[in-house]
Interface confidence: medium
């Protein structure tokens, strides 16, 4: 059988091979479709209610003015030419409908790294056959059940039109330290071949990197906290909590008498500045959290170790809060 695909609602003409171009003709069409119990026979004489669905044209072709889902099936024509030679035509008709452009609804504007997040729901309406939805990350296909990707799919069929609505909900677990602005898109692939996929507009949620509550981050510049005499060290206390907590500083376990600030600068380091520093973040909602402690030490000239750029002028190694 020859495969024929026709778009729902469009006309379709099936040729009856070997039939004389005009009457009188000896031919018959046999149909086995969603509209028939078994085989339905149509002749050139026609007439009756079937004419609105399918009728034989003067040249012997079968004409369907508007193909519907029920017209899927087998169409056969048997024709005899003027010399009595018999020719058979055999068609398998499949119908299709391209849906509207798929859309991502309920899209997330922010994802949290390290935990499963719903990215959004992709919806395609009005397809036949159903087809499939697939997700893409930065243009590359996402494979469900791989690397923290899961997809929940749902297919519904319209009770009157018979067309399909597809839904696909994407859940991902973004990797920590990964792309802070990934691009997701969704595409609909038709169930019948030779038709292009339809892609949604992309979405670009922001990935938020949570730091566990107990992790108040203390960063030292230069790394290691070892500097030459007269060098400068900066200590930065970073807490991702919103609103920003108050940051206080401690040296050797004793609070420093300084106003709260996220950065502590130790200019023109002298022996009195050596010690162990930490910061304490005080949240309004939960109690204080202390960072790890870092050791600030002076490298005597000639010693190995990282150095900070020295600064001009002479000072007493006073603490400066930044």
């Amino acid at each position: 059988a020859q495969n024929i695909t026709a778009r729902i609602g469009e006309p379709l003409v099936l040729k009856c091979k070997g039939a004389p171009k005009k009457p009188p003709q000896r031919l018959e069409w046999k149909l086995n479709t969603g509209r028939t119990e078994a085989w339905k026979v149509l002749s050139p004489q026609g007439g009756g209610p079937w004419d609105s669905v399918a009728r034989v044209l003067p040249n012997g072709s079968l004409f369907l003015p508007a193909v519907g889902i029920q017209d899927e099936g087998i169409f056969r024509c048997q024709a005899m030419n003027r010399n009595g030679k018999e020719t058979k035509s055999n068609y398998r008709v499949r119908v299709y409908q391209i849906p509207g452009k798929p859309e991502i609804v309920d899209s997330a504007s922010e994802l949290t790294a390290g935990v499963p997040n719903k990215v959004g729901t992709c919806v395609s309406e009005g397809s036949y056959p159903a087809g499939t939805l697939s997700w893409h990350l930065d243009g590359k296909p996402l494979v469900p059940n791989e690397k923290g990707v899961s997809v929940k799919e749902q297919t519904r069929r319209h009770p009157e039109t018979g067309l399909f609505t597809l839904q696909s909900e994407l859940m991902v677990t973004p990797a920590r330290g990964g792309d802070p602005r990934p691009t997701f898109s969704c595409s609909f692939s038709p169930g019948l071949p030779r038709h292009r996929a339809l892609r949604t507009a992309p979405i670009q949620p922001r990935v938020w990197e949570p730091v566990p509550l107990e992790e108040v981050q203390l960063v030292v510049e230069p790394e290691g906290g070892a500097v030459a005499p007269g060098g400068t060290v900066t200590l930065t206390c970073e807490v991702p909590a919103q609103p920003s907590p108050q940051i206080h500083w401690m040296k050797d376990g004793v609070p420093l008498p300084l106003p709260p600030s996220p950065v502590l600068i130790l200019p023109e380091i002298g022996p009195q500045d050596q010690g162990t520093y930490s910061c304490v973040a005080t949240h309004s909602s939960h109690g204080p959290q202390e960072s790890r402690a870092v050791s600030i030490s002076i490298i005597e000239p000639g010693e190995e170790g990282p150095t900070a750029g020295s600064v001009g002028g002479s000072g007493l190694g006073t603490l400066a809060l930044a």
């Epitope: 330290g177 802070p180 990197e209 730091v211 981050q217 960063v219 510049e221 230069p222 790394e223 400068t232 900066t234 930065t236 970073e238 991702p240 920003s244 300084l258 106003p259 600030s261 996220p262 950065v263 600068i265 200019p267 990282p306 750029g309 400066a320 809060l321 930044a322």
Partner: antibody, heavy 115, light 107 residues
Framework: QVQLQQSGPELVKPGASVRISCKAS????????IHWVKQRPGQGLEWIGW????????KYNEKFKDKATLTADKSSSTAYMQLSNLTSEDSAVYFC????????WGQGITLTVSS | DIVMTQSQKFMSTSVGDRVSVTCKAS??????VAWYQQKPGQSPKALIY???YRYSGVPDRFTGSGSGTDFTLIISNVQSEDLAEYFC?????????FGGGTKLEIK
């Protein structure tokens, strides 16, 4: 010596995105913060935010939270700033700056947003 | 946000003079203020941090002072190469904020 080499000037259309780079050399990239600063003619300097390449933590000025995305590539010692949904208000010179002390600045990159 | 106000947009001085550039913070920022110099067509250059500490290589004619809300950058014995715009910046609170700048003109 310490250097921050920024990418060349950019001319982009409104609504587009752009990613500008800042290549660090002469020091340990992962040991110092990289700040980004915006300068519009006659409008002074605005702090956008920082990234710490050592752990890829970021801190943004709320004003730029939905405009700028800061990233860093340790392997190439390069910090990046992506600016999205560009408008004429984003036309400016953008500087990258090393460290909380702000002791070294890149040469700046001129971004022009125009149709 | 903390507002850093440099009330004088322009200052005119002569070579050899002493000039004071002022900066006022809208709230207490301790000594967490830096000063930057920006020459035409160049990126800013760090001069002073922690209100009064000079960076390496900065001539000692540049002096910073102040704490709390009032800060001053003093340039003594002004040189022609000091023709530039000077910005203050606070880093006591996020977001870091800059003053609007003071342009120094040499007569």
């Amino acid at each position: 010596q310490v250097q921050l080499q920024q990418s060349g000037p950019e001319l982009v259309k409104p609504g587009a995105s752009v990613r500008i780079s800042c290549k660090a050399s002469g020091y340990t990239f992962t040991s110092y913060f990289i700040h980004w600063v915006k300068q519009r003619p006659g409008q002074g300097l605005e702090w956008i935010g920082w990234i710490y390449p050592g752990n890829v933590n970021t801190k943004y000025n709320e004003k730029f939270k939905d405009k700028a995305t800061l990233t860093a590539d340790k392997s190439s010692s390069t910090a990046y700033m992506q600016l999205s949904n560009l408008t004429s208000e984003d036309s400016a010179v953008y500087f990258c700056v090393r460290g909380q002390l702000g002791d070294y600045w890149g040469q700046g990159i001129t971004l022009t947003v125009s149709s | 946000d903390i507002v850093m106000t440099q009330s004088q947009k322009f200052m005119s001085t002569s070579v050899g003079d002493r000039v004071s550039v002022t900066c006022k913070a809208s709230q207490n920022v301790g000594i967490n203020v830096a000063w930057y110099q920006q020459k035409p067509g160049q990126s800013p250059k760090a001069l002073i941090y922690s209100a009064s500490y000079r960076y390496s290589g900065v001539p000692d004619r540049f002096t910073g002072s102040g704490s709390g809300t009032d800060f001053t950058l003093i340039i003594s014995n002004v040189q022609s190469e000091d023709l530039a715009e000077y910005f203050c910046q606070q880093y006591n609170n996020y977001p870091r904020t800059f003053g609007g700048g003071t342009k120094l003109e040499i007569k």
